[in-house]
């Protein structure tokens, strides 16, 4: 007798590998016999696709090799003409051992930027990632972070970040290892040692010492008065990232020599300078024999101290007086951080003004002195304690700094403005203005022994001065 | 840019005063940091600075001609003049004015195209 | 006075390097300027402060100076190179000196 179709073993839930067989039964039992077909996600699987084998009278479903796009909702429909068609539908979850799809690289980075090491992978179950770094697992911190995708993450990357490092994919069916990478953190030149001044006799030797660090490791070269240095004994060493180099020279002439750290990232280079000045004890050349040319200031240092209208002489003793001077400049306002407010605009002034002299209008280009009366102010009201440290701490051999060889002037040694008030500069705006008070404060200490004029002032801060030798 | 002229008489007779005028245009003459200079160049010789007047009309003169030379200026027309007196045929060249600036060490940075002036009776 | 001594001519081969001097007594102590003169022509300046190129001069033209003697480099010389070059410094008193003049053969 004709009896409608009856699924006797509904279809289940199947695991399968990748690449392995899967296999779906659907037990009819009917007759006349019935025409069986079969759907993924309600798509007909037509029976000549060589991925499927359809056997049994099409009661049993096998995919040959499963793929990871496999997985989904299959059904089994039977009719027979008998009664309605019956249906029953299982699902195929496609289970995947860990598989790296994009390991991780090798990273240069430059320390204190972010570093991204990645690892994306593929599986089912979805696999855990982790990172050893050398031999330990990595532990994560406030900088170190495995991010979702499974990429590690490092925020302001240090030295010791540096090393070798592999994740690691992790799910019930197995564990996936990338190779592996080396993450190389590269350092910016740093001097951690510069230069110290030094003020000698004619023909005696001085070593001047730098020390650099840096990854890779800087290399060291010296500049005299804006060239390579063409005599001296330079002598190198390099232990645990640092390179330490000493320049020994035979003094004849005073000389700015600058220390340049450099290395190299990709195709870019860092560079840290420092500077020392070697002065001759007694070297003092006339006036007349200064030797430069005037130009308006085109530095950053001295922006907003010098006359914004005026000529400064640059020094030809210099090969490249605009950036020697400018770094003469910048090595001593670094020390100027650390003295008082009140000291600190005039010391500045002083300063720019001094390295950066005002150029005399006439037919030679000459520098300007800077008027006597206003030094002393510097020396004795607005800079009276730090000026008196600095000279005791250079009478013990103790100075490190450039400032008291180069970049502050001997006042003693000055013209004073009452001898001829055109043939020096002034610093109008050390004048404390009581109709102006924002110049700078009252002064709470007894009156100086100083002469200063009473010229107008103003809030800003540009003053003008120089001194009365030039290093050629 | 600044522009240079001279203008004078091409001819001069032996012990008369020698007169020049030099035009300035594109600047002023007593703008600072620069000055002004008459410098000459006789016949197949090499060149010889006369004299000098700076900015603030102060001038200065080569020593072998000091007493013979006088240089003077008019600002409101922006010239500047050569006196040289008692010539002699010796004093025959090319005059050029020129302008000396301190932003290149007090070089001569622009010249005037020349006078002749010959000295002759 | 201040005297500055030039050798009358220098000759060169076209491309090579030309070397003029100027003698003089300490002129490593003073900028030294050096001029261009063409036949007809007024001089142009073509370097200032011992070793300074105008801006619109060659870079083959380049200057040193020290001790007693300046130097005029021109490096590559060229045709348009041929004149008369003259070594200029101010002395102490604001006085102009200018050397003799030499003149620059390229072949």
């Known amino acids: 007798l004709p009896k409608a179709p009856v699924i006797t073993t509904p279809l289940e839930t199947v695991d399968a590998l990748v690449e392995e067989v899967a296999t779906f039964m659907c037990a009819v039992e009917s007759y006349p016999q019935p025409e069986i077909s079969w759907t993924r996600n309600k798509i007909l699987i037509k029976l000549f696709d060589t991925r499927y084998s359809i056997r049994e009278n099409g009661q049993l479903l096998t995919i040959l090799s499963v793929e990871d796009s496999d997985d989904g909702i299959y059904c089994c429909t039977a009719n027979n003409g008998v009664g309605g068609a019956v249906e029953s539908c299982g699902a195929l979850q496609v289970k995947m051992k860990p598989k790296i799809t994009r390991p991780p690289i090798n990273v240069k980075i430059i320390e204190g930027l972010k570093a991204v090491l990645p690892c994306t992978t593929m599986g089912n179950p979805k696999p855990s990632v982790s990172w050893i770094k050398g031999d330990s697992p990595l532990r994560e911190n406030s900088r170190t972070a495995v991010l979702e995708s499974g990429s590690l993450r490092i925020h302001n990357v240090q030295k010791e970040d540096a090393g070798q490092y592999r994740c690691v994919a992790k799910n019930s069916l197995g564990t996936a290892y990338s190779k592996v990478v080396k993450l190389e953190v590269e350092v910016f030149a740093r001097i951690l040692r510069a230069p110290e001044s030094h003020n000698v006799t004619f023909g005696s030797f001085v070593t001047l010492h730098c020390t650099a660090t840096g990854i890779p490791v800087p290399t060291i070269t010296w500049i005299e008065n804006g060239n390579a240095v063409s005599s001296g004994s330079i002598q190198e060493s390099v232990k645990d990232r640092v390179i330490d180099s000493r320049l020994q020279l035979f003094i004849t002439k005073p000389g700015l020599y600058t220390c340049i750290a450099t290395n190299k990232h990709g195709e870019k280079f860092s560079t840290a300078k420092a500077a020392a000045t070697v002065s001759i004890a007694e070297w003092s050349k006339p006036q007349k024999d200064n030797k430069g040319y005037c130009a308006q200031y085109r530095g950053e240092v001295c922006n907003a101290v010098l006359a914004k209208d005026a000529l400064v002489f640059l020094n030809t003793s210099y090969a490249d007086p605009e950036e020697a001077q400018e770094l003469l400049v910048h090595t001593a306002w670094n020390e100027l951080k650390v003295v008082s407010p009140l000291c600190r605009p005039a010391a500045e002034a002083l300063l720019c003004n001094h390295v950066f002299q005002e150029c005399s209008p006439g037919v030679v280009p000459t520098p300007i002195p800077i008027c006597r009366e206003y030094c002393l102010a510097v020396k004795e009201l607005f800079c009276a304690k730090e000026w008196l440290a600095m000279e005791e701490k250079t009478h013990r051999g103790l100075y490190r700094s450039e400032m008291h060889l180069l970049s502050v002037p001997e006042c003693s040694k000055l013209p004073s403005m009452h001898w001829d008030p055109t043939a020096c500069a002034r610093l109008p705006h050390l004048d404390y203005n009581k109709e102006n008070p924002k110049t700078f404060p009252p002064m709470t200490s007894s009156k100086p022994s100083v002469d200063i004029p009473n010229l107008p002032s103003s809030s800003s801060s540009s003053f003008s001065v120089s001194p009365t030798y030039s290093m050629t | 840019q600044v522009q240079v002229q001279e203008s004078g008489p091409g001819l001069v007779k032996p012990s008369q005063t020698l007169s020049l005028t030099c035009t300035v245009s594109?600047?002023?003459?007593?703008?600072?940091?620069?000055?002004w200079s008459w410098i000459r160049q006789p016949p197949g010789k090499g060149l010889e600075w006369m004299g000098v007047i700076a900015y603030d009309g102060s001038t200065y003169y080569s020593p072998s001609l000091k007493s013979r030379t006088s240089i003077s200026r008019d600002t409101s027309k922006n010239q500047f003049s050569l006196h040289l007196s008692s010539v002699t045929p010796d004093d025959t060249a090319v005059y050029y004015c020129?302008?000396?600036?301190?932003?290149?060490?007090?070089?001569?940075?622009?010249w005037g195209q020349g006078t002749q002036v010959t000295v002759s009776s | 006075s201040y005297e500055l001594t030039q050798s009358p001519s220098v000759s060169v081969a076209l491309r090579r390097t030309a070397k003029i001097t100027c003698g003089g007594d300490?002129?490593?102590?003073?900028?030294t300027q050096w001029y261009q003169q063409k036949p007809g022509q007024a001089p142009v300046l073509v370097i200032y402060a011992d070793s300074r190129r105008p801006s619109g001069i060659p870079e083959r033209f380049s200057g040193s100076n020290s001790g007693n003697t300046a130097t005029l480099t021109i490096s590559g010389a060229q045709a348009e190179d041929e004149a008369d070059y003259y070594c200029?410094?101010?002395?102490?008193?604001?006085?102009?000196?200018f050397g003799g003049g030499t003149h620059l053969t390229v072949l």
């Open positions: 200029h410094v101010w002395d102490s008193s604001t006085n102009a000196w």
């Open positions: 300490n002129i490593g102590s003073k900028n």
């Open positions: 020129a302008r000396g600036s301190s932003r290149v060490a007090a070089a001569f940075d622009s």
């Open positions: 594109g600047g002023s003459i007593t703008a600072r940091y620069y000055s």
